[in-house]
């Protein structure tokens, strides 16, 4: 969490941002909130990016003002116009690119004063794994598959019964480049699995950690998958 203040005493306002991550090819949110004002027409929001000459986005007098927007953000940005009045200056970024990573500044002017806060935005690719029983194999195996990751993640298997066991000798992981030549499909196979056990396939890079669990018993099969972004720190 980054909390920024304006420069001059009583003319400063609090602006708060949250470091976040964007999934390339999808839409992302750059979070920013501020002390709200009564009149929308008195609020100015400017989003800037370090190293970029033009503005990322500007909103003033109740509408977008994009005459000074940098070309790299043309047609890809929007604020939540109906939420600006309650202090939400978050920016929606369409079709996130690897090059969108960097330091952004959320700069706010209201009738109460000015304020700004920086935000670190990471970009990459992350997806939830599917873990399935592979009955085609000679011995019972599990196959963990996740369609899009970047940068290349690590893959680790774990088991509820054999806690702390190292499965690297009985697993095989491969990374296959996807058609857009950036992200990769992750496939990991675990051999010699036993029944009445829960296995977890954990995929992690510096942006996200995803886990796929599977529990196989005589009477049921239970699957779970979840994902956590690793760098959601507020400023």
């Amino acid at each position: 969490l980054i909390i920024g203040f304006g420069i001059s005493g009583r003319h400063s306002i609090t602006v708060t941002t949250v470091a976040s991550a964007g999934n390339i090819g999808e839409d992302g949110i750059l979070s920013c909130t501020f002390e709200p004002d009564i009149k929308l027409s008195d609020i100015v929001i400017q989003w800037l990016k370090e190293g970029v000459l033009g503005l990322v986005h500007e909103f003033k007098e109740g509408k977008d003002e994009l005459s000074e927007q940098d070309e790299m953000f043309r047609g890809r940005t929007a604020v939540f116009a109906d939420q600006v009045i309650v202090g939400n200056a978050s920016l929606r970024l369409k079709n996130v690119q690897l090059t969108d990573a960097g330091t952004y500044k959320c700069y706010i002017i209201t009738s109460k004063g000015k304020g700004n806060a920086n935000l670190e935005y990471k970009t990459g690719a992350f997806s939830m794994p599917e873990v399935n029983v592979d009955y085609n194999a000679s011995s019972e195996t599990l196959r963990c598959e996740a369609p899009r990751w970047f940068p290349q993640p690590t893959v680790v298997w774990a088991s509820q019964v054999d806690q702390g066991a190292n499965f690297s000798e009985v697993s095989n992981t491969s990374f296959e480049l996807n058609s857009e030549n950036v992200t990769m499909k992750v496939v990991s196979v675990l051999y010699n699995v036993t029944i009445n056990n829960t296995y977890s396939c954990m995929i992690e890079n510096d942006i996200a950690k995803a886990t796929g669990d599977i529990k196989v018993t005589e009477s049921e099969i239970k699957r779970r998958s979840h994902l956590q972004l690793l760098n959601s720190k507020a400023s």
Epitope: D134, Y135, R143, E220, R223, L227, L229
Partner: antibody, heavy 130, light 107 residues
Framework: QVQLQESGPGLVKPSQTLSLTCTVS??????????WSWIRQHPGKGLEWIGN???????YYNPSLKSRVTISVDTSKNQFSLKLNSVTAADTAVYYC??????????????????????WGQGTTVTVSS | DIQLTQSPSFLSASVGDRVTITCWAS??????LAWYQQKPGKAPKLLIY???TLQSGVPSRFSGSGSGTEFTLTISSLQPEDFATYYC?????????FGGGTKVEIK
Amino acid sequence: QVQLQESGPGLVKPSQTLSLTCTVSDGSISSGGYYWSWIRQHPGKGLEWIGNIYYSGSTYYNPSLKSRVTISVDTSKNQFSLKLNSVTAADTAVYYCATEKALATVTPSGYENYYTVDVWGQGTTVTVSS
Amino acid sequence: DIQLTQSPSFLSASVGDRVTITCWASQGISSYLAWYQQKPGKAPKLLIYAASTLQSGVPSRFSGSGSGTEFTLTISSLQPEDFATYYCQHLNSYPLTFGGGTKVEIK
């Protein structure tokens, strides 16, 4: 969104094998995150899950039918199939093919996948009778 | 297998009524429950997944709640097109099972 269409004989003799095919359009059967399912509904009754298959070939079956069921996938034809052998009159039902899909939901710690049967075929009636 | 019990099996209601259908699971299933609507001669249609998440395109008069073993589907103001049979389904583990259904009829 994918569309599904069931096909196969509407009448099967007792003790024979019921064979149905589901053709997938507006999407690839090789897409990750989808499980290709069969569900049936006996006349005037509720729904019964038969089983499903992932594009890689992993299958999951209802234990009550497991000994008689085979679900297979043909990625080249964008189709998946159901075979149910040794049929009796009790297998008379409307058979639906459907997609079981992982839908990500926001949780306090990130995201969690919730599976749900979100797209269904129109259904095909199969009668078992001599 | 996880058994799902729906109540009531039949329900007579009028347009504008608030309708509540309950689904009980034989064991805890967290929020792994979906609700479907089925009209005669048609395939079921997904209304709600993850117990309370409204499927895209489904009217906001439909809502779901519950966790663990007890779940409810509520229609806040019944419309003519809502007269149908409603099913709950757990997605906690395989085999998936459905509730027996609740038929909502015009009073």
